[in-house]
């Protein structure tokens, strides 16, 4: 008998998954930028806003060159999971002032979830250790006021923007190493 029949190729491979993750990250970055601009138009920010529960920015321009695939993917997933929870919290507890942005926040959440699934698939295909997608987190309390929820939204969108910006650069760099 001849060699056994091979398997047909599935829809994607790790390199295609990485390409897909880059495209999803870029489009999420554009969405975030647009939503942040809408926020600034509707609710002008008085300076920079921060939120203690948000992850600290993982990378700087100086550290990009030393990135390793497992570290980048793990950190990116953990950070994006945190932002996903914050977006869910905004939609749930943001109050009437943010209700006008509900369609955009809903779309942002859906895209974030899609990117996280793609990253999980990539890590499975590479057989890299994976942090649990639904790790227990510090519960987010309701914003102290309407202005508190607006400040939180500015902080969340600003932080997500910076995270996605380094993510695009990091993922593009990793493409050359896979």
């Amino acid at each position: 008998p001849g060699p056994p029949a091979g398997s047909p190729r599935v829809s994607s491979d790790p390199r295609a998954d990485l390409d897909s993750a880059v495209l999803l990250t870029r489009s999420l970055l554009a969405d975030t930028r647009q939503l942040a601009a809408q926020m600034r138009d509707k609710f002008p920010a008085d300076g920079d806003h921060s939120l203690d529960s948000l992850p600290t920015l993982a990378m700087s321009a100086g550290t990009l060159g030393s990135l390793q695939l497992p570290g980048v993917l793990t950190r990116l997933r953990v950070d994006l999971m945190s932002y996903l929870r914050h977006v869910q919290w905004l939609r749930r507890a943001g109050g009437p002032s943010l209700k006008t942005l509900e369609p955009e926040l809903g779309a942002l959440q859906a895209r974030l979830e899609r990117l996280l699934r793609r990253l999980q698939l990539l890590m499975s295909r590479l057989a890299l250790p994976q942090a649990a997608p639904d790790q227990p987190v510090i519960p987010l309390g309701p914003p102290a006021s309407a202005w508190g929820s607006i400040r939180a939204a500015h902080a969340i969108l600003g932080g997500l923007h910076l995270t996605l910006d380094w993510a695009v650069r990091g993922l593009l760099l990793l493409k050359t190493r896979l």
């Epitope: 390199r15 497992p70 999980q120 499975s124 057989a127 890299l128 639904d134």
Partner: antibody, heavy 114, light 111 residues
Framework: EVQLLESGGGLVQPGGSLRLSCAAS????????MHWVRQAPGKGLEWVSV????????YYADSVKGRFTISRDNSKNTLYLQMNSLRAEDTAVYYC???????WGQGTLVTVSS | QSVLTQPPSASGTPGQRVTISCTGS?????????VHWYQQLPGTAPKLLIY???ERPSGVPDRFSGSKSGTSASLAISGLRSEDEADYYC???????????FGGGTKLTVL
């Protein structure tokens, strides 16, 4: 077309050793994590071990920990499983699989019996 | 004892819709890891049928679909055909093992 071809199976006595190999072709082997999964006669699938795309991470099922060693040679597109201190309950068809696993070989039968 | 729980058997007549369930725990499906489904025809190696909960590899008919909710997942097969008679396995990554875990398998009989 993706092909995974296992070899090295056979009859071995309890306490003995075997080395399984899996030759891969038709895809970028070095971009995929690789698994060994086994299936005892008439039973379900049991994951045995996994090695990351570059060999830097290796994990094992509790049932084989300390006895089996997974390795890979990306220059030869080949995956290995060194099996020591074999027991009767290790008798199974051993499949090599790539990715999620996305692709599976046809399997090689390992029989541990005196 | 398998880590993921599936019914040992399921059956249906040609043209019918059947579903196969898969229940996990807080370290695999319940932790948010994606679920994958495999079909194993008699005497052959398993074949990927559904990945990432509901995505189909190329060549898999759209009669096969997957879904996931909480700690469980299910595979649905509509327009059942005689060639669908096989063993079906679910799998998910398990964070405590750092590897995939499988269900015990469901033998599907087309009556």
């Amino acid at each position: 077309e993706v092909q995974l071809l296992e070899s090295g199976g056979g009859l071995v006595q309890p306490g003995g050793s075997l080395r399984l190999s899996c030759a891969a072709s038709g895809f970028t082997f070095s971009s995929y994590g690789m698994h060994w999964v086994r299936q005892a006669p008439g039973k379900g699938l049991e994951w045995v071990s996994v090695i990351s795309y570059d060999g830097s991470y290796k994990y094992y099922a509790d049932s084989v920990k300390g006895r089996f060693t997974i390795s890979r040679d990306n220059s030869k597109n080949t995956l290995y499983l060194q099996m020591n201190s074999l027991r009767a309950e290790d008798t199974a068809v051993y499949y090599c699989a790539a990715g999620v696993p996305d692709y599976w070989g046809q399997g090689t039968l390992v029989t541990v019996s005196s | 004892q398998s880590v993921l729980t599936q019914p040992p058997s399921a059956s249906g007549t040609p043209g019918q819709r059947v579903t196969i369930s898969c229940t996990g725990s807080s370290s695999n499906i319940g932790a948010g890891y994606d679920v994958h489904w495999y079909q194993q025809l008699p005497g052959t190696a398993p074949k990927l049928l559904i990945y990432s909960n509901n995505e189909r590899p190329s060549g898999v008919p759209d009669r096969f679909s997957g879904s996931k909710s909480g700690t469980s997942a299910s595979l649905a097969i509509s327009g059942l055909r005689s060639e669908d008679e096989a063993d079906y396995y679910c799998a998910a990554w398990d964070g405590s093992l750092n590897g995939p875990v499988f269900g015990g398998g469901t033998k599907l009989t087309v009556l």
